[in-house]
């Protein structure tokens, strides 16, 4: 297996209510194959937010192309961000598996909300 | 459902060439990527061409700088641009939709192209 | 790039079950699947992503992955399954699309 890492840039990101907030996240190679998620949090109890793969996410769109064959950017952006979204969200890969097999997890990004500007 | 459906296949001489068309419905076509994939007469299937849905393109070495995939999201429509064929290119050609990891999931029932002299 | 290897042929009763293998991907670097092809037709996804089942395929068709070989298990064989499969792979390292030459199933 080939060495991967998992970057996530940003220690913490501010976004103001009702904008949308980018959560950028590389990762160094695409072996071994398998899917990329977003969790809030971590442990049994974290929120998936974005699953390559499967299921509708619907306020959260990736950055880059995801059906490009070389994508390494899995970067997201949600939209219409509340303050309920505060939180540590992590960009995990996976390996392929039954089920997946989780490989390694980006730092984590804070994301902090600011009142909307009246 | 999903469709697809391919057209533009016909008889051609050696050197020239054909724009295959696969018109799509029942997806958002503009999501997915798409792959065109042919089969010889009595053979097996080989990948083509493949292009992402942002525009990026992808081919097997034996047609490289021959033949030229390319869509249009606003007409739902995956192309195939084929040149200076050869007798080798003769097969049924198959459009077929992506799954996430670069598979198929559905395919047309596939335009057949004859190069003969 | 690779070659993906299966039985040219395998025959099977009505009930029994039939297992078709592929060989020769990178595990790690490789997803796989299994196209069904009758007669004059164009192919069927029957499993993708090495062991996923289309919504739409009955559930005797199931897929599995050990090492560096994929299996394609019939359970309760039917005459309708009689057709060529072909194990498809897509390789992360090289971005290209490979299929094997294909299995003829035979319900005796």
């Known amino acids: 297996e080939e060495e991967l890492q998992v970057i996530q840039p940003e220690k913490s990101v501010s976004v103001a209510a009702g904008e949308s907030a980018t959560l950028n996240c590389t990762a160094t190679s695409l072996i071994p194959v398998g899917p990329i998620q977003w969790f809030r949090g971590v442990g049994p109890g974290r929120e998936l937010i974005y699953h390559q793969k499967e299921g509708h996410f619907p306020r959260v769109t990736p950055v880059s192309d995801p059906t490009k064959r070389n994508n390494m950017d899995f970067s997201i952006r949600i939209s219409n961000i509340t303050p309920a979204d505060a939180g540590t969200y992590y960009c995990v890969k996976f390996r392929k598996g039954s089920p997946d097999v989780e490989l390694k997890s980006g730092a984590g990004t804070e994301l902090s909300v600011r009142a909307k500007p009246s | 459902d999903v469709q697809l459906v391919e057209s533009g296949g016909g008889v051609v001489r050696p050197g020239e060439s054909l724009r295959l068309s696969c018109a799509v419905s029942g997806f958002r076509f503009s999501s997915y990527a798409m792959s065109w994939v042919r089969q010889a007469p009595g053979k097996g299937l080989e990948w083509v061409s493949g292009i992402s849905s942002g525009g990026d393109t992808y081919y097997v070495d034996s047609v490289k700088g021959r033949f030229t995939i390319s869509r249009d999201n606003s007409k739902n429509t995956l192309y195939l641009q084929v040149n200076s064929l050869t007798a080798e290119d003769t097969a049924i050609y198959y459009c077929?939709?992506?799954?996430?990891?670069?598979?198929?999931?559905?395919w047309g029932l596939g335009t057949l192209v004859t190069v003969s002299s | 790039s690779y070659e993906l290897t299966q039985p040219p042929s395998v025959s099977v009763s009505p009930g029994q079950t039939a297992r078709i293998t592929c060989s020769g991907g990178d595990y790690y670097s490789t997803y796989y699947a299994w196209y069904q092809q009758k007669p004059g037709q164009a192919p069927v996804t029957v499993i993708h992503?090495?062991?996923k089942r289309p919504s739409d395929i009955p559930e005797r068709f199931s897929g599995s992955s050990s090492g560096t070989t994929v299996t394609l298990t019939i359970s309760g064989v039917q005459a309708e399954d009689e057709a060529d499969y072909y194990c498809?792979?897509?390789?992360?390292?090289?971005?290209?699309?490979?299929f094997g030459g294909g299995t003829k199933l035979t319900v005796l």
């Open positions: 077929a939709r992506e799954t996430w990891n670069h598979l198929f999931d559905y």
């Open positions: 992503s090495d062991d």
């Open positions: 498809g792979g897509y390789d992360g390292r090289t971005y290209i699309n490979t």
